[in-house]
């Protein structure tokens, strides 16, 4: 996150790192909690990696550098890429995953609503994106979980930013017009949130941008509305029944 | 320790065909994205193709789009590059590598093979 | 696809730093690797990620790399460091190497 200020415990338990381990162990991702089981997160974070083993979610983190061996996580028993993603193109850039276990909410580690399918019309105000990603460009992974307040704009604004690019209706933006807060490497796949009438949705998925907080470029996001017919496939399919947290 | 160890190369005629294989070991194979690099004789390397670590995705120079095929088969620890169409520019020393790559940092290849070496000519 | 350019050659005398320069358009927003390669033997990698080295390499090996050149230094330089140096930067699906630098300690 450029432009961010530390998150407090508590303050976004639906938020998961996405960690590999092949030699080293490192943050690749972020991620959503959306249920016991789930977490939604972004398909690029898997480009290149193994979809298999490697891999350790942690949740209800506040600071990277207190993982231990000893600290619990999560591994994966499913990843559910969009059928429709494809590498080094911006579509579709959206991923389920299925946990070994289901997870016990508590204070630190509980869901995130997901907006209603579709969702067009509800303007947000107050939106905010979180990672442990880059503070700079060409940065490093940040041990204090990073929060920003970012606002919305629209996707024909974004597209002028994105001359060269297609920004689809399934993605949403958001950025300052004279950049310095974005989101940045390492925060991907992780959420944009909004609140609305005292409650927060999971609005976007951390998908790509120019660089990090530029002037005019904002930061794209996957537009999670857009995906609600295909998370709650998937996560029916594979359950049975689905567990999501749904708006009221 | 890492291993790659190369093989199939040879003297073919234009048109033709060949396969080359790499056996690797001392390292989880299917856990890494792997890579074919050539370099014909006096000259510089040249990125071919690489292939992910399930063989979900394979990516390929233009030169060879079309013609090369890389793949792989995780039980037996071993990458292919299947050279069909074959012309005289093929003809290098073909390399297979072991690549560390994610979305963060890019790619780079941290282990070589010793390469094999194709000329095309009648 | 970007292209990017190295100088055929370098020379240096001994005990002094070589420096051996990548340029490519808008390199510095890319994370650049190297690789040393002397005759009749495989690349071996002595710097990725713009700046990092691996365990194996000495620590006479140093990267940088800004705007749109990218720089190998080597301090100190010895008699077994001639050889030829590529770099390489990943774009887009795409992974691209520079043409070379053939380095010669005088």
């Known amino acids: 996150i450029v432009g961010g200020t530390n998150s407090s415990w508590g303050e976004w338990p639906w938020q998961v790192s996405l960690q590999v381990k092949l030699t080293a162990q490192r943050h690749l991702c972020g991620g959503s909690l959306i249920g016991h089981q789930w977490v939604l997160t972004a398909a690029h974070c898997f480009d290149g990696l193994p979809l298999q083993d490697v891999w350790r979610i942690y949740s209800g983190i506040l600071n990277l550098s207190d993982i231990t061996k000893d600290t619990p996580f999560s591994q994966i028993k499913e990843i559910i890429i969009h059928q429709n993603y494809k590498v080094s193109e911006g579509n579709h850039d959206i991923a389920l995953i299925k946990l070994q276990a289901p997870l016990n909410y508590t204070e630190f580690q509980k869901p995130i609503c997901l907006p209603s399918k579709g969702d067009t019309s509800t303007i947000y105000t107050n939106c905010w994106v979180t990672g442990w990603g880059f503070s700079k460009e060409k940065g490093e992974i940040q041990n204090i979980l990073q929060k920003v307040n970012i606002p919305l704009v629209t996707n024909e604004e974004c597209q002028k930013a994105y001359a060269d690019a297609k920004i689809a209706q399934a993605m949403v933006c958001a950025g300052y017009k004279e950049g310095g807060k974005d989101a940045c490497k390492g925060d991907s796949g992780g959420p944009l949130v909004c609140k609305h009438n005292g409650m927060w949705r999971l609005v976007g998925i951390t998908s790509w941008g120019e660089g990090c907080a530029r002037r005019e470029q904002p930061g794209v996001y996957t537009k999670v509305a857009e995906y609600m017919d295909w998370i709650l496939e998937k996560t029916q399919s594979s359950d049975g029944k689905a567990q999501m947290q749904s708006p009221a | 320790e890492v291993q790659l160890l190369e093989s199939g190369g040879g003297l073919v005629q234009p048109g033709g065909s060949l396969r080359l294989s790499c056996a690797a070991s001392?390292?989880?194979?299917?856990?890494?994205?792997m890579v074919w690099v050539r370099q014909a004789p006096g000259k510089g390397l040249e990125w071919v193709s690489y292939i992910y670590p399930s063989g979900g995705a394979t990516f390929y120079a233009d030169s060879v789009k079309g013609r090369f095929t890389i793949s792989r088969d995780n039980s037996k620890n071993t990458l292919y590059l299947q050279m069909n169409s074959l012309r005289a520019e093929d003809t290098a020393v073909y390399y297979c590598?072991?690549?560390?790559?994610?979305?963060?940092?890019?790619?780079?290849?941290?282990?070589w093979g010793q390469g094999t070496l194709v000329t095309v000519s009648s | 696809q970007s292209a990017l350019t190295q100088p055929p050659t370098v020379s240096v005398s001994p005990g002094q730093t070589a420096r051996i320069t990548c340029s490519g358009n808008k390199l510095g927003d890319k994370y650049v690797a190297w690789y040393q390669q002397k005759p009749g033997q495989s690349p071996m990698l002595v710097i990725y990620q713009d700046t990092k080295r691996p365990s194996r390499v000495s620590e006479r090996f140093s990267g940088s790399n800004s705007a749109n050149t990218a720089t190998l230094s080597i301090s100190g330089t010895q008699a077994l460091d001639e050889a030829d140096y590529y770099c390489q930067a990943w774009d887009s699906s795409i992974v691209i190497f520079g043409g070379g630098t053939r380095l010669t300690v005088l």
């Open positions: 590598a072991m690549g560390s790559y994610d979305y963060i940092w890019g790619f780079y290849s941290d282990h």
């Open positions: 001392g390292f989880t194979f299917s856990w890494y994205t």
